[in-house]
């Protein structure tokens, strides 16, 4: 069976029907490049005016304008708000009332696209494997990133969150139109990774999405993540404005000027430092969501009532922090280089600025407890990775899971830890699952490109697709079309239940209280320490225009000791950055 031309609110669209075997039978209808909105520079998205005739939806559209990985050029385009749909079809009748899974990509709110990284036309976010194996409709889409998606003056002149509003427009488009493709508009699951996972979280918290979202999956990221909300957007707006020659004293004039500035210039005016800085790299993620009093009306921690009826899966990778550790403490990945106590203390103090000297010392002490009996470099490097994983991913996710569970009415809550080790040959032997390592398994790459993977990788992928799509279908990862290797029990506040996802998933994979000692430290001990600075996110502008990152704060109340200068070789940002 195949859909043929489909009538949407914008007009007719026609995709391609791809047979899944030479013998005929099952197939998948694929639509690429359907417009869901339009947007002017630094303005909220508007509904698309539509078209006459039949739109040939056969090619991915260009990504939203963003800097290249080298950050010295741009690619993509401003006209980028398009979505892609995969609809699995059986032999006889066209599919009807299928669950819908809407993917939100990651990329630090700075990069990425709905189709994902591409190698020889093999796109990372190709929805075919999920759609056909799980019998669900998969939707991916583009949203604006970087300054064009998130620049904000912190007031009505440039409220920001344009990228979040693009995401909302895509979700709302799916709600209104997906029935025509055979989807159930009342069963939409949004899922995403890293910045996409935080976006998923923010979309569930936003009052704009009331009634649109049935379920959600956040993979390595939450609205509560320290890198997910910009507390000082005006500082960064001024930084960009100065670089492109716009006035900075009056936000109205600044906004008006920025809106007529070449979008490429705006994009290139910001560079994420990829060499070690005074502060951890996440402090320099400038263009990210803001609390605008509208789309995100309040601090995310106060918005969990809005998720009371949204089923949620949230989890992290067991070494999510590794990617960030390699930038902040480059020696982590270098066998011939050593991590010192000073290196780690400097990292800790950079992540605990708000609590000053006491916060840094308490945190340093608990994380280095094991160093007395095992002062090996392997243990110290693992500690650095564990610390970054905790601060950036685990703790925010655990707090969010607890909040979701506490506010739940009809909603169910599930937690996981992805522990299938990275396949990167250059990584240390002790390496676990790095940030973004889960993506290939969720999107079925071990099946799509079998020669690049082992049977154990296919086992992981099969299990994840089964749990994810069952959850989309029923709200329970165990119940649906796909058999699962073991029963995944819901998260409870008492036990902190989570599924440990490895190559062999058994009943023993259901575990409790992940890193409970550290969770208690952050939630209780650290939390009650007095705050010593007004705003840990305030960075002063660079004095030299050529400087990549702003200087650290020059606030007298800043009590962060500066460790000795580290002359070690500085690591470059990996080309496959996923956050």
């Amino acid at each position: 069976a195949k859909l043929g031309a489909v009538y949407t609110e914008g007009g007719f669209v026609e995709g391609v029907n791809k047979k899944l075997s030479l013998l005929g039978g099952d197939s998948v209808d694929i639509f690429k490049g359907i417009p869901f909105a339009t947007a002017k520079t630094l303005e909220n998205p508007q509904r698309h005016p539509g078209w006459q005739g039949t739109l040939k939806a056969t090619n991915f559209k260009k990504r939203c304008l963003q800097a290249t990985i080298t950050q010295d050029n741009t690619y993509g385009q401003e006209d980028c708000l398009y979505l892609n749909i995969w609809v699995p079809q059986g032999r006889k009748q066209v599919s009807h009332n299928l669950p819908v899974m809407v993917w939100i990509y990651g990329g630090a709110f700075l990069m990425g696209s709905g189709q994902g990284a591409n190698f020889l036309k093999n796109y990372l976010y190709d929805g075919e494997e999920i759609a056909t194996r799980g019998n669900v409709i998969v939707v991916t889409f583009n949203y604006r990133v970087g300054p064009l998606g998130f620049l904000s003056t912190g007031d009505a002149n440039l409220p920001g969150n344009f990228g979040l509003r693009d995401q909302h427009m895509a979700i709302a488009w799916v709600k209104r139109n997906i029935a025509a493709f055979g989807g159930d508009p009342d069963n939409i699951t949004i899922f995403g990774e890293s910045a996409g996972a935080a976006s998923v979280s923010l979309q569930t918290l936003s009052p704009y999405n009331k009634g649109l979202i049935r379920r959600a999956i956040s993979q390595s990221g939450m609205a509560l993540s320290p890198w997910a909300i910009q507390k000082n957007p005006l500082f960064w707006a001024k930084t960009i404005a100065k670089k492109v020659g716009c006035p900075t004293e009056d936000t109205g004039k600044m906004a008006a000027c920025l809106k007529i500035t070449d979008p490429r210039a705006l994009t290139l005016a910001y560079k994420l430092p990829v060499k070690k800085q005074e502060y951890p790299v996440v402090h320099y993620l400038a263009f990210i969501p803001v609390i605008d009093g509208d789309f995100i009306p309040d601090d995310p921690i106060n918005l969990y009532n809005n998720t009371a009826d949204i089923d949620y899966i949230a989890g992290i990778n067991n070494m999510d922090g590794h990617l960030f550790a390699t930038i902040d403490v480059p020696a982590v990945d270098k066998t011939k280089q050593t991590v010192t106590e000073e290196d780690f203390y400097r990292l800790v103090s950079g992540h605990t600025v708000a609590k000053g000297l006491k916060g840094a010392q308490a945190t340093f002490d608990i994380y280095t407890e094991s160093w007395a009996q095992d002062p090996s470099q392997e243990n110290m490097k693992k500690t650095v990775v564990a610390f970054e994983t905790d601060v950036l991913f685990l703790i925010p996710t655990e707090i969010a899971l607890a909040q979701h569970k506490a506010h739940a009415k009809s909603a169910k809550t599930y937690s996981y830890l992805f522990s299938h080790p990275s396949r990167m040959p250059i990584y240390p032997k002790w390496m676990g699952a790095d940030h973004a390592d889960d993506l290939q398994y969720v999107f079925g790459k071990p099946f799509a490109t079998p020669l690049g993977y082992r049977p154990q990788d296919r086992a992981v992928s099969k299990a994840m697709i089964a749990y994810w799509t069952n959850f989309a279908r029923s709200g329970d990862p165990n119940m649906g079309n796909s058999p699962v290797p073991t029963h995944w029990y819901p998260y409870t506040l008492e036990n902190g239940n989570y599924l440990d996802i490895t190559k062999t998933i058994t009943s023993a994979s259901m575990k409790e209280h992940l890193r409970e000692k550290f969770l208690k430290f952050w939630a209780v001990t650290f939390e009650v320490l007095p705050t010593v600075t007004g705003d840990q996110d305030t960075l002063t502008p660079p004095e030299d225009d050529s400087e990549v990152a702003p200087d650290p704060p020059s606030d007298d109340s800043q009590v962060v000791p500066v460790p000795p200068t580290d002359d070690s070789v500085e690591a470059q940002m990996p080309a496959t950055i996923g956050f």
């Epitope: 007719f12 509904r47 005016p49 539509g50 078209w51 006459q52 005739g53 039949t54």
Partner: antibody, heavy 119, light 105 residues
Amino acid sequence: QVQLVQSGAEVKKPGASVKVSCKASGYTFTSYNMHWVRQAPGQGLEWMGVINPGDGATSYNQKFKGRVTMTRDTSTSTVYMELSSLRSEDTAVYYCARDYYGSSPLGYWGQGTLVTVSS
Amino acid sequence: DIQMTQSPSSLSASVGDRVTITCSASQSISYMNWYQQKPGKAPKLLIYDASSLASGVPSRFSGSGSGTDFTLTISSLQPEDFATYYCHQRSSTPTFGQGTKLEIK
């Protein structure tokens, strides 16, 4: 100027079929979608479906699926709506209506065709 | 399908009156239009995209709203305005409101 001229009134028996035509003029026929909307006596408007005259693509209201067929003849700039298995509740005025622009409202309407289904 | 609920279903007014008709959608919509229909005639487009006036339509007609709630306003009723008014949402399955009959008081 844009004109949509529909065929005349029809009286049909239950179970029969009816085919209503709508001849377009004053614009490029293949450039705009054509919709069919019906209105039962004293009732509101009900969308039946749409055809793209360019390639013949159609989409029907689920309510009429299996009973309605929309076709077009580009040589005469005419669209047709055929409704089968007629029942008394199909008695209505049937309108063809052309899109205004883009994905737009129904900007131009035919004069309507009364179809009466009676035994 | 998206349901459109119009209110009131009928109303009496006098020439020169200001009249407001509302339409509520069962979910947020993108494309909202208003039509006028007189007895024995085809509907006529008045307002498209919630607030844009169709060509040839007098400026006393205006539309507003977004999301789920929309309004058609006639600022000063004229004798030729007595008719039935329909709201209409454009989606993959377009639907109409049940109509508002505007009668002379």
